[in-house]
Structures are given as structure tokens and as C-alpha cells.
Interface confidence: low
Amino acid sequence: DPVLCFTQYEESSGKCKGLLGGGVSVKDCCLNTAYAYQERNGGLCQPCRSPRWSLWSTWAPCSVTCSEGSQLRYRRCVGWNGQCSERVALGTLEWQLQACEDKQCCPEMGGWSDWGPWEPCSVTCSKGMRTRRRACDHPAPKCGGHCPGEAQESEACDTQQVCPTHGAWAAWGPWSPCSGSCHGGPHEPKETRSRTCSAPEPSQKPPGKPCPGPAYEHRKCTGLPPCPVAGGWGPWGPVSPCPVTCGLGQTIERRTCNRPVPQHGGPSCAGDATRTHICNTAVPCPVDGEWDLWGQWSTCVRRNMKSISCEEIPGQQSRWRTCKGRKFDGHRCTGQQQDIRHCYSIQHCPLKGSWSEWSTWGLCMPPCGPNPTRARQRLCTPLLPKYPPTVSMVEGQGEKNVTFWGRPLPRCEELQGQKLVVEEKRPCLHVPACKDPEEEKL
């Protein structure tokens, strides 16, 4: 049969907590031994763990409210898939019975004494009441018992005396005009009213009491505008921390216009709310290192070979750079200090060449001297050999690019009687004078 499955079993109360859902079998619910289940009709909550005795229930109330009785408590075999011990099935109850006594004795009723004498009349004039009393001590009740009926009775009495008339206040008169024009100043403005003891006046014979309380009443005036309050500076606050960890910084002190706060049109505080000071950490600031330019590439060589120049044999070359300027624990330069690449050496190799196109015209030289000229060139450019542009290195490192290195000796057919460089020169026209721009401002 499907059951309700819960995620917790509360040992102390025996209740299922955290409903997971219904319509599942006990077997599926109890795949997790921390879970618990309950029949759909609101039956007993059973934990999914192996069966064991529950905690003892609280003791039931004593069977009698006075003198000796007895009381029961129980525990239950709860769990799933088994029993608590031999011959003790799931759901079995085990009982304990003990003697109990809520109250040692049972109450017994007492009896009344005779009525006492009548007390004096409750008033000294006109009509009132008088009372008499009796005691519950013939015999006295036992163990919290009582006597039936009332312990006192009352009846009317007449003093045959005329009562005096006591004074009573007439209605309050109107409020007087206000004693000031704004509130919150040194003297709080107020209004006053008075009343007379005449409704009625106290009798002379027999003498009546005067009216109780004051004949005058004062109250604060309402609806007045507040008195203006001029602002006053509070004390300077603490100096803020130095905002820098090295070199010079600037700290600040603040004060607030709150002693008192300006109110109701009163003037604000004069002067500054802040003041600043220089703070000196006396610590030099760190300077990070910076890479210098790369040095020249070293000669292209191959280990264990005297020279690979003009050969289709890849070699290696390296260049270095230095980390400059690091001071006071600044950051070191990031990156590599050494750069390595693969190369073919064409140093001083005789190579077939071809003439380049004309270069663009160069700058006018000398820029500030007499008769400046500009030049352009055609160069005998070497035709590089068709060696493989990449080489395979150690297993797993893939292909590496190979660079030609060195100054070859290109061979071109003679051009205008030249073998390496043909140059053409022209004069520069309309040349302005060189002047210091700062002097020109004057």
C-alpha cells in the first residue's frame, strides 16, 4: 500500500517531519534509513531505520487528584523491516506503572461559628450599610476544604444625621492670551485659565469639604512657530588615516555644525567644516622595474659544429635584456630575460641579388646647414635561398619558424657603374631658417 514519505523522524516526539510526498511504497521510502513513513489514514509515524524502542512517553496524569494513586507511561517498538528483539514485533507497546500522589490528603469541609456583633454604620450621616462576620472554624476545614455559605452579611442602617454639602468646581473659564510668540526659547510661552468652587459652594453647618485640586491651570501654547536656533560647531573629530602608504599625503579633520544644529531659520556655523594637514609616511614609494631594449641576436650556431654559414642547416641564437630601475621593493619585470630562436646563417654568403625599386625621398640634410639636399637609393637586395621556413623539433613540441640571420654578399649586374647602391640627390627648395620656438614667443 502507498504511504506518506518524510525526510526526518523526530525521536523526542515520535513525529514525522518534512513531507517528501505520498503514493510511494514503504520499501522505496526506506531506501534512505534516515527517512520515515506514515499510513495515509494518519496512523503511527515509523522511522525507516532498523527497529528499536522509542523514548519513554511522559507519565500520564495521576489516576486520582488527592491521596495515593498510580500513573502509566509507555514506549513503542518503532522502525522498519524487523523487530526490536525476539517475539517483540513492530508497533508493540511496553508499559511502566508507578505510584503517584498529587496531593497528600483529600479536602474536608468545615463548619461556621456563631455570627459576630454588627459593625458601625458605614456612614456618619444619612443612610448606609452595616456588616457582621462569622468564622469557618467549627470545625476548621482540612486539606484545603471550605465552609458552605457566606462569611459575612450586610443590612441598611440610618444615622438620623443631616449630611454636609461638599464643594464642587464650576466650569473652567476661557484661556488667557499666550505669554510669548515662539516656542523653544529660554521661557516656554504658556496660557492660563481659572475656575470657582461654586457648583455648589461647601456648606457652613455642618461644614462641607472645600473643592479638591487647583483653581488655576497652565498649558504650553500650541501653533507657535519655533524660535530660531543659531548653529554651533562640535569638536574637531579624529584626524583621518594618512591616505597613502608612501611619500606625502593629506589627512583631514572634520567637525559638524551640531552643537546645536541650526534650526528654524537660525544662522548656520561660520567657518570650515574640514581642515587638512600634510602627512608624511617617511617611506619612499616603490619603483617597478622596466625591461631595457633587447640586445643584439648572438651568432647563429649549431652545437658541435664549427660553422653553419651558407648551409641549409638550422641553428639557434639568443638575445638578452635587463630589468632596470627597480627600487624600494617595486615589482620585478615580468616575462623572459632571454629570447631564443631558430636560424639559418647567411653571414658573408655570396647570394644572387636583384635591384630594388627607388626608395622614397629621404629628409633634407643638413636641416639647418647650407644647401640641404635629399636623396633616394636603389639597393642590390639578396635573393634568400629557398630553405624550409619551419623545422620539426623534439617530439610533441611541434613546428618552429626559422629566420635567416647575417649579412650576405649580394651579387647584382652593374647598374650605372655600381654593384651595391645607386643614389640620386636633389636640392631642397624654399628652406626656412631654424629658430628656437621659445624665443619666437617673446
Partner: nanobody, 119 residues
């Protein structure tokens, strides 16, 4: 001029958390200190927490260990993370920036954000 805009206020149960944020715009290069102040009804405005340009912090005794102030210079924001909130933390919270000029400082304030902590 510096403009400050607060956000993140609201109603929270005692023991809960809120994160207030203050975005600064305008002439922010000369701001050195940023701070959070608060003002409860009928009381004076009081300092809650302050942070300098290099991250030095100052906290009011009543919030030490519960509130954390931080700044993100890339976004020009200052944040107040408020944990274990108490009913007495109920107030309007104001962002404050202190700008240093050559001849002294200038105070700038946001419009305030309401924080209400219910018991």
C-alpha cells in the same frame, strides 16, 4: 562638482543583511576619502564607516565586526556590506565624498537611502 547616487536600501528582518552602493561621477580624480553616514529620526547624522584612497578604513564602534566598507576605483563606487542588522541600525544612510583641492577640502553628499530593520 561631484555627484553621488546611493542604492540598495530597503526593509530587512533583524539579523539579515543589506548591501549599499554609492556611485560617484563628475570630478572624481581628486576624491581621497569616501564614507557612509546615517541619520535616525530625531538624531544627529553620525559616521558609520570611512575608507581612504589606499583602502585604510575607520568604523564606528557600534558597527565594528558587522559592517564592511570597500571601494572599486575602476567603477567609481563605494560599497557598505551590512550583516547581522539590528533594529537600532534603522536610519537614512548617506554617501559622503571628500574632495581635496590645492587650498582645502570640499564635502559632497548623496540624497540618502532608507534602511529599515524590523524586529
Amino acid at each position: 562638482e561631484v555627484q553621488l547616487v546611493e542604492s540598495g536600501g530597503g526593509l530587512v528582518q533583524a539579523g539579515g543583511s543589506l548591501r549599499l552602493s554609492c556611485a560617484a561621477s563628475g570630478r572624481i580624480s581628486s576624491i581621497i576619502h569616501m564614507a557612509w553616514y546615517r541619520q535616525a529620526p530625531g538624531k544627529q547624522r553620525e559616521l558609520v564607516a570611512e575608507i581612504s584612497r589606499v583602502g585604510t578604513t575607520v568604523y564606528a564602534d557600534s558597527v565594528k565586526g558587522r559592517f564592511t566598507i570597500s571601494r572599486d576605483d575602476a567603477k567609481n563606487t563605494v560599497t557598505l556590506q551590512m550583516n547581522s542588522l539590528k533594529p537600532e541600525d534603522t536610519a537614512v544612510y548617506y554617501c559622503n565624498a571628500l574632495q581635496y583641492e590645492k587650498h582645502g577640502g570640499a564635502d559632497y553628499w548623496g540624497q540618502g537611502t532608507q534602511v529599515t530593520v524590523s524586529s
